[in-house]
């Protein structure tokens, strides 16, 4: 019965970008402005997403596809389909309830989102510190002495601790 009904259902002939208008003898009508249908056979068109405020339009709505939003400069997307915008911070900072705060000594963040993370502990891999970390950059671990071969970098001992944010040159 279902198969027979679908074969006889005039709405199944309505393509994406239209809807099956019950008020007009199930004629396929184009989606009204600011609405879309992404699949055929739909009895209604969906309202287009509107990118307002901190959201900006990345892709305009068409009769067959929804609008896509991203975030205005200074913010980045979070969640599926960019459902939220979160404030950017500078490299070397993390976002807290009180705004962007510098990473504590011994931690870093090399991105404009996310949290400050502890520097890599080179000794866990039996390696030594090749370059010291900063609040913007992780420590770089060097090969253990046994790994060194001709042409490879020699391992430098850890330099005295620097204030975070001062890159070793």
């Amino acid at each position: 019965f279902e198969r027979t009904r679908s074969l006889q259902d005039p709405c199944s002939n309505c393509p994406a970008g239209t809807f099956c208008d019950n008020n007009r003898n199930q004629i396929c009508s184009p989606c009204p402005p600011n609405s879309f249908s992404s699949a055929g056979g739909q009895r209604t068109c969906d309202i287009c997403r509107q990118c307002k405020g901190v959201f900006r339009t990345r892709k305009e709505c068409s009769s067959t596809s929804n609008a896509e939003c991203d975030c205005t400069p200074g913010f980045h997307c979070l969640g599926a389909g960019c459902s939220m915008c979160e404030q950017d911070c500078k490299q070397g900072q993390e976002l807290t309830k009180k705004g962007c705060k510098d990473c504590c000594f011994g931690t870093f963040n090399d991105q404009k989102r996310g949290i400050c993370r502890p520097w890599t502990n080179c000794s866990l891999d039996g390696k030594s510190v090749l370059v010291n970390g900063t609040k913007e950059r992780d420590v770089v671990c060097g090969p253990s002495p046994a790994d060194l071969s001709p042409g490879a970098s020699s391992v430098t001992p850890p330099a005295p601790a620097r204030e975070p944010g001062h890159s070793p040159q």
């Epitope: 490299q91 870093f108 090399d110 404009k112 090749l130 040159q169």
Partner: antibody, heavy 127, light 110 residues
Framework: EVQLLESGGGLVQPGGSLRLSCAAS????????MSWVRQAPGKGLEWVSV????????YYADSVKGRFTISRDNSKNTLYLQMNSLRAEDAAVYYC????????????????????WGQGTLVTVSS | QSVLTQPPSASGTPGQRVTISCSGS????????VTWYQQLPGTAPKLLIY???HRPSGVPDRFSGSKSGTSASLAISGLRSEDEADYYC???????????FGCGTKLTVL
């Protein structure tokens, strides 16, 4: 020895789709960031996308954002790039690249560069 | 147009020392590690320098990297014919949330 073997390239019409694969061997695939880098004929290198192994985070170049999707299957040691809505300017050799710095011990791979590369697969976009 | 600027070409004679520059900004080179790649004709790129100035195992000490502020340099001493290749600098750019490559420098050994 690190080995990366790309496949899936070919000729596609503008607006079409392709899925590239990169089979990895010779290292612990699940411990490393992986990137796709492309090079248009006679042009320079352009980074396309990176995927992290620990949190699955992904990042994309602005030129491909919303059209390309990077993914990985650690159980199959394989990296993927799904390319939709292809444009003429996407035509290039696509390289799969392994980053240095094994995770989770290493927190960030950016210092270590891309220390392993495949030989590339050619994507041609033409009508 | 790349956010990292490299000279399109450089040249030298065998035995000479050549330097290739790479200029960026505080959002990339200024606060992040620079890497350098060599691409010989018809081959995939190869990592030459990581973390601004360190050589992976197997890279000759003729190659050296340095960084100052928002600029980086690759120096090749004792130039050889087999060094003829394209050289690229690269780094992470936090404002773009992605990696960036320089446009490449074609090195010719005369």
């Amino acid at each position: 020895e690190v080995q990366l073997l790309e496949s899936g390239g070919g000729l596609v019409q503008p607006g079409g789709s392709l899925r590239l694969s990169c089979a990895a061997s010779g290292f612990t695939f699940s411990g490393y960031d992986m990137s796709w880098v492309r090079q248009a004929p006679g042009k320079g290198l352009e980074w396309v996308s990176v995927i992290y192994p620990d949190d699955g985070n992904t990042y994309y170049a602005d030129s491909v954002k919303g059209r390309f999707t990077i993914s990985r299957d650690n159980s199959k040691n394989t990296l993927y790039l799904q390319m939709n809505s292809l444009r003429a300017e996407d035509a290039a050799v696509y390289y799969c690249a392994k980053h240095g710095g094994q995770k989770p011990t290493t927190k960030s791979s950016s210092a270590y560069g891309m220390d392993g590369w495949g030989q590339g697969t050619l994507v041609t976009v033409s009508s | 147009q790349s956010v990292l600027t490299q000279p399109p070409s450089a040249s030298g004679t065998p035995g000479q020392r050549v330097t290739i520059s790479c200029s960026g900004s505080s959002s990339n080179i200024g606060n992040n590690y620079v890497t350098w790649y060599q691409q010989l004709p018809g081959t995939a790129p190869k990592l030459l320098i990581y973390a601004d100035s360190h050589r992976p195992s197997g890279v000759p000490d003729r190659f050296s990297g340095s960084k100052s502020g928002t600029s980086a340099s690759l120096a090749i001493s004792g130039l050889r014919s087999e060094d003829e290749a394209d050289y690229y600098c690269a780094t992470w750019d936090y404002s773009l949330s992605g990696y960036v490559f320089g446009c490449g420098t074609k090195l010719t050994v005369l």
